[in-house]
């Protein structure tokens, strides 16, 4: 009876592991055996392929091959018992783009309102993606095991820090893969499950900011307690997407270690251009606080993002405030080309009772204004980039009366 | 393979100073911490300091603040840790290991004993 | 700086015993808790990191839990390589520090 070839055979590559798996033609013929042949493009010969030869089952692993995986290469197979079918030829296909990215590897750190989630591929030094280990993102899956709401986090890299969560719960997650650059998404990892701990007795500092004074960088942070020590750490941003290395070498800011105060000055020498994070931690000589959640700082807009200019044309009922470019030093306008979004705080001065407008233009009028009044405004900038939200310091106050009575046009 | 290959035992004289060497190979130094530890005869294990070999950063522990030294030699892939104004509470075995990733201690060296006897 | 202390000190026990040891934690470190094993006349060799994470060769006898401030090591089944004296360290805060140490000895 002439044997029939296999049918149907797929090829599965999951990062560097090639995996085949067809249909028996003809499930009553027992014994059967079967191989296969590769051709690599360009080439007339077959050559066998180790590891899928005299197979029993219907899956074989083709892993050890050392393959180009961006040339195309041609599968056949056939069924042998006391004589054999003929080839059945598989359709040709480039490895790189049959591989699917396969689960991640996840470790997690539990603080009290914080879990570390440091990603790692799945197949350390993989071939497949060895001229993409830098392109890896990451999204994941997050949910409180009592509840089972999903929250999706999308476009992280290998260490993320999730932040705002509660003491003393169990939270659930799961990571995925991706590179954007060849339309690639990966497989989900295997649940993690970590519980936070209980909360802290100190809890981290908060809402840092950096502004620019001068030559120096002026770091500001609120915190619940008086009489502690800070300290202020910093690392460069593009550390987090390094594949694999999970040491992240923090550094200190010199200027910013065991200051008592809730703000801290060093010098704008102290960053070369990039772009950096910055954290915060609080100590009271006993205990000490988690780290703060991680601020990112952008040398290039921090520098050149500086207090507005204003003038204020008074009327008896309003102000009409004129917003200009910023003066560097020399009285020379600073361009700044990306969009802005100002906020103007305004006060009676004898009152302490702040109000604010949010303007994306250029002249704004603030309404409903006493005559006869001394008010102040002062205003900053804020860039329009939700990734990279900064904000300029404030202007000095500019204090103004309002005109008499009907006086408003 | 990671391998921390560390200087012989040391007799020094109370008020003297040591200095004990580290030689790492399978990795690359500047890629991680370098630490030290020691352990009195007996006792249990005491975090003396690290070093950051890529850029010389180091973090003491107050205990040794202002006698203990940690330098590196990246071009030859060894750390060194210099102990001064010993005394005989000093005498211990100092390790000095790796900081990998999650800041672990993951690979040691032999140990060195430091004997301070006059 | 923060106190690690592990009960208890001594702690004997029998070829296939499940023995657990303690460490507590003078404040909150999160899970940045490490277990080392050591042997006479050797250098400590690394058990568990991040309190629950096994290293790699390490038999799965060998477990660890806990977190905030309390902290365990678990084995399951004692084997005879496993009488040595295994330590806690936190790694949180600097300085780092280990607890005094636990030792594991035949009964």
């Known amino acids: 009876k002439n044997l029939k070839s296999p049918q149907k055979v797929e090829v599965d590559i999951i990062d560097d592991n090639f995996i085949l798996r067809w249909n028996r033609s003809d499930e009553s013929v027992g014994n059967v055996t079967f191989s296969f042949d590769y051709q690599k493009t360009g080439m007339d010969n077959w050559i066998k392929l180790s590891g899928c030869q005299n197979i029993t089952s219907t899956k074989c692993n083709f892993s050890s091959l050392k393959l180009n995986v961006y040339e195309e290469i041609k599968l056949r197979i056939r069924a042998e018992k006391e004589n054999t079918s003929s080839w059945y030829e598989v359709d040709s296909f480039t490895p790189f783009r049959k591989a699917q990215i396969g689960p991640p590897e996840v470790h997690l750190e539990a603080e009290d309102k914080a879990i570390v989630i440091h990603i790692s591929p799945g197949t350390k030094d993989s071939v497949m993606w060895a001229l993409d280990g830098l392109s890896f993102t990451y999204s994941l899956v997050i949910w409180k095991n009592s509840s089972g709401v999903e929250e999706r986090i999308e476009n992280i890299y290998s260490r993320h820090k999730i932040y705002k969560l509660s003491p003393e719960t169990t939270y659930c997650l799961k990571v995925k893969a991706a590179l954007l650059t060849s339309w690639k998404i990966g497989v989900y990892s295997p649940v993690h499950c970590i519980k936070t701990t209980v909360e802290n007795e100190l809890p981290p500092p908060e809402n840092i900011e950096v502004s620019v004074q001068n030559q120096n960088y002026v770091l500001k942070w609120d915190y619940t307690y008086a009489n502690m020590t800070f300290q202020v750490q910093w690392l460069h941003a593009f550390l987090k997407r390094n594949p694999g290395n999970h040491l992240y070498k923090w550094k200190q800011i010199p200027d910013c270690e065991n200051v008592k105060t809730t703000q801290c000055v060093f010098p704008q020498n102290v960053f070369q251009k990039g772009i950096y994070l910055l954290r915060v931690q609080a100590s009271d000589g006993n205990n000490t606080s988690f780290w703060s959640e991680e601020i990112k700082f952008d040398t290039e807009i921090q520098a050149f993002l500086l207090p507005p200019v204003f003038n204020i044309r008074s009327l008896s009922d309003s102000f009409h405030i004129y917003i200009g470019a910023p003066k560097q030093s020399g009285n020379t306008p600073v361009i700044q080309d990306y969009p802005l979004i100002y906020e103007i705080i305004f006060w009676e001065n004898t009152s302490n009772a702040e109000r604010k407008i949010i303007e994306k233009k250029t002249d704004v009028t603030v309404p409903n204004l006493k005559p006869l009044t001394v008010y102040c405004v002062k205003a900053r900038a804020h860039t329009m980039d939700e990734k990279l939200n900064k904000s300029s310091v404030f202007s000095d106050a500019v204090c103004e009366k309002t005109k008499p009575g009907n006086t408003s046009k | 393979q990671v391998q921390l290959v560390q200087s012989g035992a040391e007799v020094v004289k109370p008020g003297a100073s040591v200095k004990v060497s580290c030689k790492g190979s399978?990795?690359?130094?500047?890629?991680?911490?370098m630490h030290w530890v020691r352990q009195a005869p007996g006792q249990g294990l005491e975090w003396i300091g690290r070093i950051d070999p890529e850029d010389a950063e180091t973090k003491y522990a107050p205990k040794f603040q202002g006698r203990v030294t940690m330098t590196a030699d990246t071009s030859t892939s060894t750390v060194y840790m210099e102990l001064s104004s010993l005394r005989s509470e000093d005498t211990a075995v100092y390790y000095c290991?790796?900081?990998?990733?999650?800041?672990?201690?993951?690979?040691w060296g032999q140990g060195t004993l430091v004997t301070v006897s006059s | 700086d923060i106190q690690l202390t592990q009960s208890p000190s001594f702690l004997s026990a029998s070829v296939g015993d499940r023995v657990t040891i303690t460490c507590k934690a003078s404040q909150n470190v999160g899970t940045n808790v490490v277990w080392y094993q050591q042997k006479p006349g050797k250098a400590p060799k690394l058990l568990i990191y991040s309190a629950s994470y096994r290293v790699s060769g390490v038999p799965s006898r060998f477990s660890g839990s806990g977190s905030g401030t309390e902290f365990t090591l678990t084995i399951s089944s004692l084997q005879p390589e496993d009488f040595a004296t295994y330590y806690c360290?936190?790694?949180?805060?600097?300085?780092?520090?280990f607890g005094q140490g636990t030792k594991l000895e035949i009964k």
């Open positions: 399978g990795f690359n130094i500047k890629d991680y911490y």
């Open positions: 360290q936190q790694k949180n805060n600097y300085p780092y520090t």
């Open positions: 290991a790796r900081g990998g990733n999650f800041y672990v201690m993951d690979y």
